[in-house]
Structures are given as structure tokens and as C-alpha cells.
Amino acid sequence: TGADTEAVVCVGTACYTAHSGKLSAAEAQNHCNQNGGNLATVKSKEEAQHVQRVLAQLLRREAALTARMSKFWIGLQREKGKCLDPSLPLKGFSWVGGGEDTPYSNWHKELRNSCISKRCVSLLLDLSQPLLPSRLPKWSEGPCGSPGSPGSNIEGFVCKFSFKGMCRPLALGGPGQVTYTTPFQTTSSSLEAVPFASAANVACGEGDKDETQSHYFLCKEKAPDVFDWGSSGPLCVSPKYGCNFNNGGCHQDCFEGGDGSFLCGCRPGFRLLDDLVTCASRNPCSSSPCRGGATCVLGPHGKNYTCRCPQGYQLDSSQLDCVDVDECQDSPCAQECVNTPGGFRCECWVGYEPGGPGEGACQDVDECALGRSPCAQGCTNTDGSFHCSCEEGYVLAGEDGTQCQDVDECVGPGGPLCDSLCFNTQGSFHCGCLPGWVLAPNGVSCT
């Protein structure tokens, strides 16, 4: 069968729809896709609760599902040839709509490694037990099914549709019926939030009799991130009921005139919006929109706000939270820059020390200065370093090349320096002769 009964839950900037029908994962994804969505993501506990709510709504409408343990496709899949990764929360699976891996998961049991076929995930519902927020549906992975053969216990699927914003449901100040038609082709009379680009048909009156007015509205963006119907004042108002019907459709206060007319009003600290129904806080900072260390600063007339960060921090892309400024990006130091929370510090390379003109400057350390020389004999300072030297008859020695070691000229690389005997001395040598021989004037030969 195709996808039949559906249920809808809209929250935040997304709507979730649940459908019954024995479809393969590919067919289910195609169904969601045709209306501009994808099989649902379950990226957090909160999202799992939204999905559970829409499934509960579906189950209340569905008379009887065939299996006690029913499965509903979600948008988590692993392509053929991609192996299981037990170290990841999603175990190597990924969301069909794309997007990053998320830390939340709720696997039913340990997954078996199999890379030979595509695998798909469904939510496992035990219909013998009530759906409780504390008992969220588990994730079950298995074959993705094929047309006409969806897989065992597959009873339906959940789609997700994302929107740039939502409108509040229309408020009726008298008898009438609102029917919302969403961009994903669902009609409903009861939505907690109505997605952008939805249409609302309002039929005023009680049933067939005295149905006098009808209205048509679209949920549209009236100003940046302000989503509204553009209706002015409560709808379907009736002098017969005044404020007694649904509080006159008013968000907060309803005031009746003597002639049966009425007006909406707001409590102290709130102001009436252009729709003449809804109240909004006079102080947008009262809802603490700024996060982290950001301070909320009211704009003129208290209409909007901006978040401000302490020194060394800047607003992130959301403009609500503070992130550390990486001052090192601007290369403020002559040599090394170390970024720190709210600031930075300059460091000098080995052989240099802080100093010299300008902030963060470094100057050469004179390692050969009096009382500082690391060399046993000669020391020559260089930029950022130094080098040691030795007097004649000595060579540099030691691991760090700072020591001087006597050269044993008697075992020099050029062979014996003396014709006969050779005596090594500190920094030098001298030749000698065997008894009966005399050292020649050249100090090397024996005669």
C-alpha cells in the first residue's frame, strides 16, 4: 500500500509528519522528498520526543497496526560498502538529508558488522506499552527493503520538513473553523505552530447556519525573522459572545465595549503588536537571549537588542554568544604569539628575550656577556644564538659544543708528527729521540 494516514507536529522551525504504510526506505524517502522534506532526523533527545509525539498522534488515529513491535523508517542509513564504526555514536550511519554526525543515539542493540548491503534505521515501537517521554523509541537497523517488500514489521515512516520560521496559530474571537494547508500538502485544524508559506482558511459562524464570513491568510515573513498572517484584530468576533469566547481571541487581556465590541490589551511590561491580538515583551532582553558572557543591550525605544561581549571576545555567527578573539591572527608579536581566553601573550624564540622598541618585540640575548658565557674558551655572539671556539691545540667538545678538548697531535690524522718519540701536552706536543739520538733543529727529526 501507499502512505496513508498522517499526523503532524510542528515545533521550533520544523514539522514532523508520521505516515502509515508498508513502504521500503527508498519509497518512504521519496514520499518525504516529493513534498520538500526528508525522512526524519533524530539528532537529540528533544527531537526524539517530537518524533515520538507525532507517532503517538498517528497511533491514536490508526485503528490497528498489524504487528505488536512496529517499525517506522527514519532518515538514518549506511551505504553499501561503508563499514560499521563502533567508536561513533551513529556507528558509521549518516542522515539522508546530510549534516554532521551528532552525539545522540538510541540503538536497540549491539550492531552486527556487515558492509555487503545498504542498511537502514527504523524506530522500534512496542505497541503493547504506552509511549512515554521517558521511554523513547529505540533505533533498529536492518535491510532497507524493496518495493512491495518493505521488511518485517515496517508499518510506516516519519518525515521532517524545515522552515525559516513559523506563525502563531490564528486566534478566533468567536465561533469558526480554521483550516491550515501546509507547504508539505497536509491540512490540519490544530497546529501549535504553523510553518512559513502555509495558507489559513477561516470560516466564521456556527456550523451551517449564520456562516457569514470567510478569510484567507498566508503565513509570511513580515520583517526579518518576523512571521505573521497579517490579520488585524481577532477573527470571527461576535457581539453575542464578546470576550467570553476564547478570551476574544486575545493573547492576554480582552476589554469589552458597551456596544458588544471589544479590544485586546496587554499586561504591564508588554505591548500590543500590529495584529492587535498578540502581546510582546517591552524589553526584549528580559528573555535573556544572549548566551555565554554576552550582555544584552537594548536598542532605542526598547524594540530590539544586540549582544555585547567582554574585551577579548567577539560575537559568534549567531550574534548571541561570545567566542574568544584569536588576537594572534593579526600577528601582534614579533616572534611567537600564544592565544589565551580573552587575550594573548607574546613569547620569544630561544636565544631572544622580550625587549626592544614596540609591543611584543624581542631582542637578541648576548650569551657571551661577562659572567654569562657558556663557552669554556672563546665565545662569539650571533643573532639569536652564539658559537664557541677554542684556542690552538684544542677542539670543541661536549654535547652542546661549549667545551674545549686538547688535541692529541701525536695521533693526528696525518700520521705521526715526530720521526721518533712524540709527547702530547695541554694544547700542544713535542718530539723526542731514543737514547744515542739527538733532536734536530727542526724539532721533529732525530740525528
Epitope: 491568510f217 526579518p224 497579517g230 536598542g299 532605542p300 524594540k303 530590539n304 537588542y305 544586540t306 550574534q319
Partner: antibody, heavy 118, light 112 residues
Framework: QVQLVQSGPEVKKPGESLKISCKAS????????LNWVRQMPGKGLEWMGR????????DYNGKFKGQVTISADKSSGTAYLQLSSLKASDTAVYFC???????????WGQGTLVTVSS | DIVMTQTPLSLPVTPGEPASISCRFS???????????LYWYLQKPGQSPQLLIY???NLASGVPDRFSGSGSGTDFTLKISRVEAEDVGVYYC?????????FGGGTKLEIK
């Protein structure tokens, strides 16, 4: 391509009324705000109001409320600006302008010059 | 209403030289969504205005990259790196954060 074609220049007497048209083509007329902007001779730009043709929702600049009416006909893709009880100070060029998804006024009509003179 | 002050009123520039126009608003145009709803338009002599920059710094389609927009929540600048003869006209800044939408008074750029 997107085009906004406005009706021709008008010469009116004080106290009369006038309806300027703006024919849109090349985009989904019902799904974008259509604004009206006034430019008095040698002066700057003033936003008068707008309409969302999809459901006829309108917003007006308080300065022009009561003096102008904005309407639209979805079937023909045409927006209208009606000016009532014309005065000499209503002499201006009136532009119709599409508002895009970033709230920019991205496509402008060629303008309609209205001259009010006795 | 959001009020804006645009400076200078008139700007004579030599071709090939840079130019800069400023716009200051009575309140921040930075929305909590991180977008700044500030726009720049150019009205060439005898023509309808045309969009140059949207949301503070984004170049509209077909606009040469010698134009650039920058600024903070209330202070904004339109820069032309090298002015060309075809750039003459009146430049307007505008805000679309809050109804009624409002325009700056305009800056007339002319060639020296």
C-alpha cells in the same frame, strides 16, 4: 527575466484621484512583497507601503496612511497604487519595487510621473 | 521610525580615485539572527534606482567588485575602490529591519 512595467505619466487637478498600475512578470507574483516608493522632484526616496499579493496583506508608512490604497490582482500579476484627494505636493515619481528574500528592493519599475496642477 | 544620516551630501571624485560614503542610523540594524539589514542603492541620472549592496556587505548580481560595503550595527560605509565615469549618480543607504522601511537622504557623486 523579472520585469515591472508601470503605467504612463499622469497630469491631474487638485482633489482628483488616480490609480497607477504596475504589471509584474518573470517571477511568482503572489510570493513576493511589492513595495511603492515615492520620489518628489529633486528629493530622496520615501517608502509608502507594500502588498503581499498572495493574500492581499498590506502595510503602510504612517505618513501616507489614509491617503493611499495599495491593491493587487493575482490573476493578471498587477499591483495598484491609488492616490486620493490629490494635492500639488503629491507631484512626484512613483516607483513599484519588488522585495526579495533578503528584504532588498531588487527590481524597480521605470517609475510613473504624476503631476498635480490646477 | 529608524532615522539615518548620510554623509557627505555631495562627493566630487577624480576618475581612478577611491570614494567613500557614510551612513549612520539611530539604532542598530544588527538582527539577533546575525544579519545586518542595511542596503545601498544607486540612482543614475534619469533612471530608476538599482540595488548595489544587500545585508551590509553582499554585492548584488551584476555589480562590479570595485564596490564594497562594511560597517557595524549603526555606522556603515560604501566604498568604491576606483571611481569610473559610469558611477555618477545619487547613492542611498536604506534599512529594512523595521517598518516603515527608510532611506538615507542621498549622496551625489560627481566627476571632478
Amino acid at each position: 527575466q523579472v520585469q515591472l512595467v508601470q503605467s504612463g505619466p499622469e497630469v491631474k487637478k487638485p482633489g482628483e484621484s488616480l490609480k497607477i498600475s504596475c504589471k509584474a512578470s518573470g517571477y511568482a507574483f503572489s510570493s513576493y512583497w511589492l513595495n511603492w516608493v515615492r520620489q518628489m522632484p529633486g528629493k530622496g526616496l520615501e517608502w509608502m507601503g507594500r502588498i503581499y499579493p498572495g493574500d492581499g496583506d498590506t502595510d503602510y508608512n504612517g505618513k501616507f496612511k489614509g491617503q493611499v490604497t495599495i491593491s493587487a490582482d493575482k490573476s493578471s500579476g498587477t499591483a495598484y497604487l491609488q492616490l486620493s484627494s490629490l494635492k500639488a505636493s503629491d507631484t512626484a515619481v512613483y516607483f513599484c519595487v519588488r522585495g526579495d528574500g533578503y528584504w532588498a528592493m531588487d527590481y524597480w519599475g521605470q517609475g510613473t510621473l504624476v503631476t498635480v496642477s490646477s | 521610525d529608524i532615522v539615518m544620516t548620510q554623509t557627505p551630501l555631495s562627493l566630487p571624485v577624480t576618475p581612478g580615485e577611491p570614494a567613500s560614503i557614510s551612513c549612520r542610523f539611530s539604532q542598530s540594524l544588527l538582527h539577533s539572527n546575525g544579519i545586518t539589514y542595511l542596503y545601498w542603492y544607486l540612482q543614475k541620472p534619469g533612471q530608476s534606482p538599482q540595488l548595489l549592496i544587500y545585508t551590509m556587505s553582499n554585492l548584488a548580481s551584476g555589480v562590479p567588485d570595485r564596490f564594497s560595503g562594511s560597517g557595524s550595527g549603526t555606522d556603515f560605509t560604501l566604498k568604491i575602490s576606483r571611481v569610473e565615469a559610469e558611477d555618477v549618480g545619487v547613492y542611498y543607504c536604506a534599512q529594512n529591519l523595521e517598518l516603515p522601511w527608510t532611506f538615507g537622504g542621498g549622496t551625489k557623486l560627481e566627476i571632478k
